[in-house]
Amino acid sequence: GITNINCSGHIWVEPATIFKMGMNISIYCQAAIKNCQPRKLHFYKNGIKERFQITRINKTTARLWYKNFLEPHASMYCTAECPKHFQETLICGKDISSGYPPDIPDEVTCVIYEYSGNMTCTWNAGKLTYIDTKYVVHVKSLETEEEQQYLTSSYINISTDSLQGGKKYLVWVQAANALGMEESKQLQIHLDDIVIPSAAVISRAETINATVPKTIIYWDSQTTIEKVSCEMRYKATTNQTWNVKEFDTNFTYVQQSEFYLEPNIKYVFQVRCQETGKRYWQPWSSLFFHKTPETVPQVTSKAFQHDTWNSGLTVASISTGHLTSDNRGDIG
């Protein structure tokens, strides 16, 4: 960076090099150039010469003042106009940053996705800090009192093999950056209570032309969990509101769910499951579209495939433009 340049003097910042966004700051430049009594001292921000709020303090030093500085990062350097020198002489440079201290991490959630071999912990980091912010996830066994710490920049995957202290743990998150540190509340977990079954997937749909046409949705999961509760939600793509059906499911075979739908309408379906009685749900599955026929039977297999973690984002980009914000891929 700019801090690695050879300096003929120095540059410093008041109150500090990294500071809270919106503060008033002063940048000082002091020349120490052999055989040069600077005629003028210049400041540059991101390569652009500053023309205002510069004060000459003495023969070798000048100060640049910014009110309400709002840029997350800036490269500053200063130069001197020396007599008998054709070009400005570089004095020194410094990278400065502004941002915010971290918020208290909240909504700490830890889940084990079946077959993943990991416990995944996430949290709401709060407002954007603009500066490098690190998180330390503390995992303390309630049985052995042993505590492990994991450093990360966002979420964390902890191998379940490393959780040797029994089944019960306390988890909390510390957030820290150059402007401050905050700590979340402690979350108590039991490893058996946080398992999320293997993803449920809708594979196909068919409409049977009976007296009252009915649509059958075929869906499945590779889970080995015996007691699983699921929800399937569906709606016409032109609607805002979802209809939800609940199922107690045994995945020893492919599930078939029946719906009585309006003819000649495009519907969208999603499914999610949880271990019965437990806290966390799967994210909603990929969007599955099925258009009911006017009268003739029809079989479709048109799933809008994408990473289920991102179902919230994908929904927002679907061309119908009518899907509601209720479509977040959350696990709560």
């Epitope: 801090t3 410093w12 109150p15 500090a16 090099t17 990294i18 000082y28 004060t55 100060r63 402007l179």
Partner: antibody
């Protein structure tokens, strides 16, 4: 030559306030930041806060926020540090220091504040 | 707050010895590190700024190095007047913080 001359030692009762002054001479007072740093007996150095006299706005360490007020009077080239709700742990030598380089290159001689009932 | 940790907290050395004091920041502070010398009953004195720049009037036996999180103050040949306590300090973020100090004593 820049000099920072501080006010004399003080003995204060718990719960009271103290105001320490720091008079600058021999340099441009208003343009450089003045900080206050304290040192409890046998302990290390602790930054309390600082001010650039020409701007008048001070920055404080969170630990002292609400209890310390740093001000400056350009007309007399004097900076002040007032600490309120004194307790015995505030017994320390209080230094003013000027930052006319990347480090604190000029220091006052220190003012001993003793908090005792 | 950025924590500054010095080691050792004290050391015994003889005149002429080479002395090294280290300072570690709890997070990267680029080269924003200053070193001070303090003698009993006196105010601190700036020795090194920007991790490695020697303050005017300070003997050349003092030198500083490092950047990021790890820094070193070296006295190449200890003199009788160098027995004192040494502090590192970061001006990178508020609150400006000091190390706990390293006392250099006569062996």
């Amino acid at each position: 030559q820049v000099q920072l001359v501080q006010s004399g030692a003080e003995v204060k009762k718990p719960g009271s306030s103290v105001k320490v002054s720091c008079k600058a001479s021999g340099g441009t007072f208003s343009s450089y930041a003045i900080s206050w740093v304290r040192q409890a007996p046998g302990q290390g150095l602790e930054w309390m806060g600082g001010i650039i006299p020409i701007f008048g706005t001070a920055n404080y360490a969170q630990k002292f926020q609400g209890r310390v007020t740093i001000t400056a009077d350009e007309s007399t080239s004097t900076a002040y540090m007032e600490l309120s709700s004194l307790r015995s742990e505030d017994t320390a030598v209080y230094y003013c220091a000027r930052r006319s380089s990347p480090g604190f290159d000029y220091w006052g001689q220190g003012t001993l504040v003793t908090v005792s009932s | 707050d950025i924590q500054m940790t010095q080691s050792p907290s004290s050391l015994s050395a003889s005149v002429g010895d080479r002395v090294t004091i280290t300072c570690r920041a709890s997070q990267s502070i680029d080269n924003d590190l200053n070193w001070y010398q303090q003698k009993p009953g006196k105010a601190p004195k700036l020795l090194i700024y920007n991790a490695s720049s020697l303050q005017s009037g300070v003997p050349s036996r003092f030198s500083g190095s490092g950047s990021g999180t790890d820094f070193t103050l070296t006295i190449s040949s200890l003199q009788p007047e160098d027995f004192a306590t040494y502090y590192c300090q970061q001006p990178y973020s508020i609150p400006l913080t000091f190390g706990q100090g390293t006392k250099v004593e006569i062996k």
